[in-house]
């Protein structure tokens, strides 16, 4: 079951101490099960298994990727898993830790010297290969900081969004990936109904910006399911 999966999400952020104020960010700590931490004059414990459900790699941390935790795991459940280090097996770039990318099923270093040819080659390989991802489509996608000393501007080739400049994300464009603008209020967005539908997108859109979510445009509620237009709207 999911509960018995390798614990990649050990004590991410702790809840407030007993009697503490609501809404205060917890402190990130890594420790064994049954963590004791101070709360006023008392001590409180928390189970260290805190799965973080996700649909896309962008929802996870930069040192994580989004996937089903077990091969036959709970259908539809994906959580953030710890990235794979160099020489570990992978199925897509996002599985490899920053500074690495997936080549021929193994995480390898993103060496500046052989960056462009090999990266684009692996993007092309994975784009046309159903087995290149855990669920049939690629997700977290931007270049490591080793490759770019400056953050990628709009139109720059990328592998991970963290390597695009602020306000940009890394999204598929034909068979490569480039930095594109994060969507603004009123812009058309993509709401993925089917798991794996990202794989069908040749021109992938970014996600909606801060304070916005991708929802059905008010005047399109009556339209058929297939033609409903989604736009970025204020919460």
């Amino acid at each position: 079951t999911l509960n018995s999966v390798l614990n990649s999400n050990a004590i991410k952020n702790l809840p407030p101490p007993l009697g503490g104020a609501a809404g205060h960010p917890g402190s990130a700590v890594s420790a064994a099960p049954g963590i004791l931490y101070p709360g006023g004059n008392k001590y409180q414990t928390i189970d260290n298994y805190q799965p973080y459900p996700c649909a896309e790699d962008e929802e996870c941390g930069t040192d994580e990727y989004c996937a089903s935790p077990t091969r036959g795991g709970d259908a539809g459940v994906q959580i953030c898993l710890a990235c794979r280090k160099r020489r570990k097996r992978c199925m897509r770039h996002a599985m490899c830790c920053p500074g690495n990318y997936c080549k021929n099923g193994i995480c390898v270093s993103s060496d500046q010297n052989h960056f462009r040819g090999e990266i684009e080659e692996t993007i092309t390989e994975s784009f046309g290969n159903d087995h290149s991802t855990l669920d049939g489509y690629s997700r977290r996608t931007t270049l490591s900081s080793k490759m770019y000393h400056t953050k990628g501007q709009e139109g720059s080739v990328c592998l991970r969004s963290s390597d695009c400049a602020s306000g940009l994300c890394c999204a598929r464009h034909f068979w490569s990936k480039i930095c594109k603008p994060v969507l603004k209020e009123g812009q058309v967005c993509t709401k993925h109904r089917r798991k794996g539908s990202h794989g069908l997108e040749i021109f992938q859109r970014c996600y909606c910006g801060e304070g916005l979510s991708c929802r059905i445009q008010k005047d399109h509620h009556q339209a058929s399911n297939s033609s409903r237009l989604h736009t970025c709207q204020r919460h």
Epitope: N13, E64, E210
Partner: nanobody, 125 residues
């Protein structure tokens, strides 16, 4: 200041139902994953259910599968926990937790960084 306020807890007979709500207010951040945790006396605080930013990926701990349902309403910045067929072992303080991030912010490891104060759920047999 960010606040998470839970409501809907109370005393219920075994086999009964409750619906917990948690409203997030304050702060100018995007809410990513949202979850419900619980802590029974003398036990560790454990995750009950969590839902991804888009709502397309939902996690439940084994003991509540088929009985509890988590959902979210982004327009209201609210997360819900519908609890059916309650058992005495569900008695605990239930806390909601969310991952709130500023625009473009992405931590090394995703986690729940804002927590509510909890609401007591007591199931009598």
């Amino acid at each position: 200041e960010v606040q998470l306020v839970e409501s809907g807890g109370g005393l219920v007979q075994a086999g009964g139902s409750l619906r917990l709500s948690c409203v997030v207010s304050g702060g100018t951040f995007s809410v990513y994953a949202m979850g419900w945790f619980r802590q029974a006396p003398g036990k560790l605080r454990e995750i009950v259910a969590a839902i991804s930013r888009t709502g397309s990926s939902i996690y439940y701990t084994d003991s509540v599968k088929g009985r509890f349902t988590i959902s979210r309403d982004d327009a209201k910045k609210t997360v819900y926990l519908q609890m059916n067929s309650l058992k005495s072992e569900d008695t605990a303080v239930y806390y909601c937790a969310v991952d709130g991030r500023a625009n473009g912010e992405r931590p090394a490891v995703a986690g729940y960084n804002y927590w509510g104060q909890g609401t007591q759920v007591t199931v009598s047999s």
